[in-house]
């Protein structure tokens, strides 16, 4: 009797279990009682990444420089092109269809993780003992200057945005 289910990498059509086309190939004709499934390779600008019965291959993604995109990995007949963003930019989504400039960390915040082509800058508040007085996409929080090691004393306390101000020790107290 005609099958109602087929093996892995097969599909059911007209009561026949037909072989799926392998990745990198598209379906030209279904199998029949007397013939195999016929498949053709995708053209150079196209791909199919699964065992399939698609009659058309998918176009490779275009990494549009006008959107700040560049090719990270060229597509093959079995894989799509992977785009990434140009220096100073990162993807707005996982599919990386457009890019935006990296965020800068404001004064009082330092860079916890530098941005990549696919992820934005991660900032963190400068903890006690550290400061950042610049807006930057690269600089971490810096430790306050240690006045003691310079044989100086703190004249003005540091904040998360400013370093301590050191000064000479008061000689009257000596």
């Amino acid at each position: 009797e005609p099958p109602t289910a087929c093996r892995e990498k097969q599909y059911l059509i007209n009561s026949q279990c037909c072989s799926l086309c392998q990745p990198g190939q598209k379906l030209v004709s279904d199998c029949t009682e007397f013939t195999e499934t016929e498949c053709l390779p995708c053209s150079e600008s196209e791909f199919l990444d699964t065992w399939n019965r698609e009659t058309r291959c998918h176009q490779h993604k275009y990494c549009d420089p006008n959107l700040g995109l560049q090719v990270q990995q060229k597509g093959t007949s079995e894989t799509d092109t992977i785009c990434t963003c140009e220096e100073g930019l990162h993807c707005t989504s996982e599919s990386c269809e457009s890019c935006v400039p990296h965020r800068s960390c404001l004064p009082g915040f330092g860079v916890k993780q530098i941005a990549t082509g696919v992820s934005d800058t991660i900032c963190e508040p400068c903890p006690v003992g550290f400061f950042s007085n610049v807006s930057s996409a690269f600089e971490k929080c810096r430790p306050w200057t240690s006045c003691e090691t310079k044989d100086l004393v703190v004249q003005q306390a540091g904040t998360n945005k400013t370093d301590v101000v050191c000064g000479p020790q008061d000689r009257q107290r000596a």
């Epitope: 030209v28 004709s29 029949t32 009682e33 007397f34 195999e36």
Partner: antibody, heavy 112, light 112 residues
Framework: EVQLQESGPGLVKPSETLSLTCTVS?????????WNWIRQPPGKGLEWMGY???????NYNPSLKSRVTISRDTSKNQFSLKLSSVTAADTAVYYC?????WGQGTTVTVSS | DAVMTQTPLSLSVTPGQPASISCRSS???????????LNWYLQKPGQSPQLLIY???NRFSGVPDRFSGSGSGTDFTLKISRVEAEDVGVYYC?????????FGQGTKLEIK
């Protein structure tokens, strides 16, 4: 229901070309399948002559050398057989077939 | 070419009794995908061949379940579990794995 019907002259002179047409109904010959010509000499077995595929490409039985040509007319949903330089040995019932469905056959006699 | 050899060439069977026909190929009919394209046909007197079995063991639509096919590689068998009067005719195996397609020489089934 798929149906095939052969047509053509029943008598052909030696050294001439035998021409037969198969008209298909119930299925488009350009959709899928291989469309075959098969013959059966009187009192003998079946011999595959060749096919034309749904995409128009061909395959022929090497035993018929280069005498056989199968073509098609998709607008009429027909495919045709030409067999050149015929001899008495080409006298047979000629069938067109999709292999699951067959025509009823047409008898061709080669005689002067 | 794949030469198809059928045995026996004729058999006479009492109605209700089983019958078995063998078809042997000179080369394996299994293709690279693991599929085997071997058909069985019955040609009743004065008629076109009719498909019984395709891909070794699949009954064509409308074929009674007393007909079954089996085998692999080079050896194939058609079995009729209980022969009926309407089963008389010539049985052919046909391989369509390799070009040229080739038929067995036929097995004539008669009723005792």
């Amino acid at each position: 229901e798929v149906q095939l019907q052969e047509s053509g002259p029943g008598l052909v002179k030696p050294s001439e070309t035998l021409s037969l047409t198969c008209t298909v109904s119930g299925y488009s010959i350009s959709s899928n399948y291989y469309w075959n010509w098969i013959r059966q000499p009187p009192g003998k077995g079946l011999e595959w002559m060749g096919y034309i595929r749904y995409d128009g490409s061909n395959n022929y039985n090497p035993s018929l050398k280069s005498r056989v040509t199968i073509s098609r007319d998709t607008s009429k949903n027909q495919f045709s057989l030409k067999l050149s330089s015929v001899t008495a040995a080409d006298t047979a019932v000629y069938y067109c077939a999709r292999l699951d469905y067959w025509g009823q056959g047409t008898t061709v006699t080669v005689s002067s | 070419d794949a030469v198809m050899t059928q045995t026996p060439l004729s058999l006479s069977v009492t109605p209700g009794q089983p019958a078995s026909i063998s078809c042997r190929s000179s080369q394996s009919l299994e293709n690279t995908n693991g599929n085997t394209f071997l058909n069985w046909y019955l040609q009743k007197p004065g008629q076109s061949p009719q498909l019984l079995i395709y891909r070794v063991s699949n009954r064509f639509s409308g074929v009674p379940d007393r007909f079954s096919g089996s085998g692999s590689g080079t050896d194939f068998t058609l079995k009729i579990s209980r022969v009926e009067a309407e089963d008389v005719g010539v049985y052919y195996c046909l391989q369509v794995t390799h070009v040229p397609f080739t038929f067995g020489q036929g097995t004539k089934l008669e009723i005792k």
